[in-house]
């Protein structure tokens, strides 16, 4: 495995007071392997609400690299290939669980964390507010 | 805490051979709170590729209940509110980390697992295969 410079303040795994702590096996089982999902790899270009993917890296987090979607346009692409501003491209957001090293630099002490990521974009009809 | 009928084969937290195992604090930290509060969207109804949410439950997993997106139509909704089959509604999929009790019924031994979930749908131009 990876050797991490150890923080001298790392909690002791045997410490019965280590808060709300459980053992987690990081030998990640991938439930997706047999399902053969249709990969959504080129949807970001083919969508009427296309998006770009931006890399977000944090070495103290697992997974360290998360790709975030950013919609390319405010509007959506119409049949002529032009941006139609009567519709809106919006990000579909999702919370994901990640593990954060805590305290930092401790090789085998983590905290569960929820972060919000944008997964892709969809085209929606706008909400029009009528001013009285 | 919770009292769980204990599996006699539960691993010993102090066992140095427990594979690739780390201590995880389950006091879930919410990174979103100060920066980006989550907004429960109605995009699943307003999208040109609308979707329904379907319940998937597995009591040995956290989160035990996952609501998955299923696109309502093969095509996309056009400006007249009709389904246009010249375009395709497709699911945007994302891998998420979940925790699985392993061995089952062990109160504080878990395994990380990756599962693929459909988060929402987007409208894409179809790939047309021309037969020679």
């Amino acid at each position: 495995g990876i050797t991490i410079p150890r923080n001298p303040g790392c909690p002791n795994s045997e410490d019965k007071n280590f808060p709300r702590t459980v053992m987690v096996n990081l030998n990640i089982h991938n439930r997706n392997t047999n399902t053969n999902p249709k990969r959504s790899s080129d949807y970001y270009n083919r969508s009427t609400s296309p998006w770009n993917l931006h890399r977000n890296e944090d070495p103290e987090r697992y997974p360290s690299v998360i790709w975030e979607a950013k919609c390319r346009h405010l509007g959506c692409i119409n049949a002529d290939g032009n941006v139609d501003y009567h519709m809106n491209s919006v990000p579909i957001q999702q919370e994901i669980l990640v593990l954060r090293r805590e305290p930092p630099h401790c090789p085998n002490s983590f905290r569960l964390e929820k972060i919000l990521v944008s997964v892709g974009c969809t085209c929606v009809t706008p909400i029009v507010h009528h001013v009285a | 805490g919770i009292t769980i009928p204990r599996n006699p084969g539960c691993p010993n937290s102090e066992d140095k051979n427990f594979p690739r195992t780390v201590m995880v604090n389950l006091n879930i930290h919410n990174r979103n709170t100060n920066t980006n509060p989550k907004r429960s969207s109605d995009y699943y109804n307003r999208s040109t590729s609308p979707w329904n949410l379907h319940r998937n439950e597995d009591p040995e997993r956290y989160p035990s209940v996952i609501w998955e997106a299923k696109c309502r139509h093969l095509g996309c909704i056009n400006a007249d509110g009709n389904v246009d089959y010249h375009m395709n509604s497709v699911p945007i999929q994302q891998e998420i980390l979940v925790l699985r009790r392993e061995p089952p019924h062990c109160p504080n031994s878990f395994r990380l697992e990756k599962i693929l979930v459909s988060v929402g749908c987007t409208c894409v131009t179809p790939i047309v295969h021309h037969v020679a």
Epitope: K114 | K38, S40, P59, Y62, V65, R101
Partner: antibody, heavy 126, light 107 residues
Framework: EVQLVQSGAEVKKPGESVKVSCKAS????????IGWVRQAPGQGLEWMGG????????DYAQKFQGRVTITADESTTTAYMELSGLTSDDTAVYYC???????????????????WGQGTTVTVSS | EIVLTQSPDFQSVTPKEKVTITCRAS??????LHWYQQKPDQSPKLLIK???HSGSGVPSRFSGSGSGTDFTLTINSLEAEDAATYYC?????????FGQGTKVDIK
């Protein structure tokens, strides 16, 4: 259909403790959490704390920290709330409520209470 | 602690009338705002979760809207059985907090 059935009314003296039970049926007990909310006579709702059954992790409101203990027993699908050092201010109806703990519409949905117990009246009087 | 302030505290309404109750949060809570109905001597019942999504078996006359700090519960055509106290509740941050309640009675 989820149902939460609470233990009966209690009369206690100041300084004593009370333990209220909440028996859950319907759905998988492990899949959700249980929150505890109280309501003093003629007053509003006040959150005391809760437990995530999957992990056995509790959260407490600071006001009750050190005085309240929330536990759950998966074998009997029952959650418990014990409040110690009772005073007349603790006279209230105590409710347990189901916290779905679902991954819903892209989010980890917690602390939105979708089913409630019938309430347990606790009277503290000397 | 996030403070939720409901208005009005009390509303007396005739049947078939439209009722609007507002809930203001002391900070941005996204959409993590829920509404409950409590009838006298009964437990609270979930009406609306996450600002605008109906709880199971809730009549369509109940709807919710809002995001951020300002939220609204609307009862479109009040029925006699809707006489109750309505509470908003935020799940954005611990401690979970509730509004002080709005009592709705029938004229």
């Amino acid at each position: 259909e989820v149902q939460l059935v609470q233990s009966g009314a209690e009369v206690k003296k100041p300084g004593e403790s009370v333990k209220v039970s909440c028996k859950a049926s319907g759905g998988s007990f492990r899949s959700y959490g249980i929150g505890w909310v109280r309501q003093a006579p003629g007053q509003g709702l006040e959150w005391m704390g809760g437990i995530t059954n999957f992990f056995g992790v509790e959260d407490y409101a600071q006001k009750f920290q050190g005085r309240v203990t929330i536990t759950a027993d998966e074998s009997t699908t029952t959650a418990y709330m014990e409040l110690s050092g009772l005073t007349s201010d603790d006279t209230a109806v105590y409710y347990c409520a189901r916290d779905p703990n679902e991954f819903w519409n892209g989010y980890y949905a917690t602390h939105d209470f979708d089913y409630w117990g019938q309430g347990t009246t606790v009277t503290v009087s000397s | 602690e996030i403070v939720l302030t409901q208005s009005p505290d009390f509303q007396s309404v005739t049947p078939k009338e439209k009722v609007t109750i507002t809930c203001r949060a002391s900070q941005d809570i996204g959409s993590e705002l829920h509404w409950y109905q409590q009838k006298p001597d009964q437990s609270p019942k979930l009406l609306i979760k996450y600002a605008s999504h109906s709880g199971s078996g809730v009549p369509s006359r109940f709807s919710g809207s809002g995001s951020g700090t300002d939220f609204t519960l609307t009862i479109n055509s009040l029925e006699a059985e809707d006489a109750a106290t309505y509470y908003c509740h935020q799940s954005y941050n611990l401690p979970i907090t509730f509004g002080q309640g709005t009592k709705v009675d029938i004229k």
